[in-house]
C-alpha cells in the first residue's frame, strides 16, 4: 500500500491524542533507554509504511501486537484517513481472525513497540533532517 495520499495531519492528531498514550501504557515499567532505535524512516509515507509493518506483521518472538489497543487505533486511523487502505484489509482481517493468538508481552514485543514509538515521533517531525 502507498501511503502518499493519507491525511497526515489527522493521523498525527489521532497519534497525539490517543495512540501515543497507549504506546506509553504498553511500555510502562520499561526504561526509555533500554532499547536502541534501529528502525528509521525518511518521510511521512515511509514512516507509515514502517509503522504498519511493525504493528501488524508478526515477527519472530513477537506475534501478538495486532490486538493491542494502540494497534487497533492505528488500523482505524489508516482506514479512515488513507484512501483505499480499508479495502486492503478485508482479506487481512479474515486471516487475522483465523490465527488469533493469546496476547503475550515478550521482551521482543517491548523492543518492537519501542521502535514504533521512535517511528511515530519521526512521523510527527517530518521536516527534521534524517540523522
Amino acid at each position: 500500500y502507498d501511503f502518499t495520499n493519507c491525511d497526515f495531519e489527522k493521523i498525527k492528531a489521532a497519534y497525539l491524542s490517543t495512540i501515543s498514550k497507549d504506546l506509553i501504557t504498553y511500555m510502562s515499567g520499561t526504561k526509555s533507554t533500554e532499547f536502541n532505535n534501529t528502525v528509521s524512516c525518511s518521510n511521512r509515507p515511509h514512516c507509515l509504511t514502517e509503522i504498519q509493518s511493525l504493528t501488524f506483521n508478526p515477527t519472530a518472538g513477537c506475534a501478538s501486537l495486532a490486538k493491542e489497543m494502540f494497534a487497533m487505533k492505528t488500523k482505524a486511523a489508516l482506514a479512515i484517513w488513507c484512501p483505499g487502505y480499508s479495502e486492503t484489509q478485508i482479506n487481512a482481517t479474515q486471516a487475522m481472525k483465523k490465527r488469533r493468538k493469546r496476547k503475550v508481552t515478550t521482551n521482543k514485543c517491548l523492543e518492537q513497540v519501542s521502535q514504533l514509538q521512535g517511528l511515530w515521533r519521526r512521523f510527527n517531525r517530518p521536516l527534521l533532517k534524517q540523522q
Epitope: S17, A76, P83, G84, E87
Partner: antibody
Amino acid sequence: QVQLVQSGDEVKKPGSSVKVSCKASGYIFTDYAMHWVRQRPGQGLEWMGTFIPLLDTSDYNQNFKGRATITADKSTSTAYMELSSLRSEDTAVYYCARMGVTHSYVMDAWGQGTSVTVSS
Amino acid sequence: EIVLTQSPGTLSLSPGERATLSCRASQPISISVHWYQQKPGEAPRLLIYFASQSISGIPDRFSGSGSGTDFTLTISRLESEDFAVYYCQQTFSLPYTFGTGTKVEIK
C-alpha cells in the same frame, strides 16, 4: 441483534438548532464509527460526517463544517448530531449508520431516520 | 470529492427480468464501492460491499462487479420486493459520497 434507535421527528424555526440522537445496542460501540447521512425530500443520500469513538474524534463533510457537530457518549453508546443555523433547505430525514473501523469498513446497519422540518 | 454517476436514472422492468445498474466514479477507486437498496419511508439497506462481496441474508440474485471507475449491480431475476431505489457509495476517501440513484420500477 444490532439496533440503532434515533430520536423523534422535529419541527424547527429557521436560524435555530436541532440535536438528533442515535442509541446503539447489540455491538461494541467503540469498534464502529457512527456516520450521519441526510436525505432531502425526493433527493439522494448525502454524507455529513462521522464520530469515531475508538479515536475520540470526528470528521466532517466540508459542506457542513462549522454548522454540524457530531459527538458521542460512550457510557450510553449514544451518538449525537447537532445542526445549527437551520434553513429551509435543511428539511430532510437524518440517518445514523455504523461502520467498522478495524474490520468490515461498510455502513451495515442504519437507524430508522429522524425527520427534521425547518419552517417559519 | 469523488463523484458517482448512476445510470439509468430509471429502469422500467417486469418481474422475472434481469436488471443491470451502472455506477461510474469520477476517478479510480479500486473496489471501494458498496450498493444499497432503499424503499419509500425506509432507511437504506446494504446489499453488496467492496464491489462484489455478498452480505448474509441478502438473496443471491443480487450480485456486484467492477473495479477502478466502472461498477455494476445485477439483479438476476426481479421479484416484486426488488422494486426500489438503488444507490452506490464510495468509501475510498473522505468525504464519502453516494451515487445519484437508480429507480427500478414495474413496467
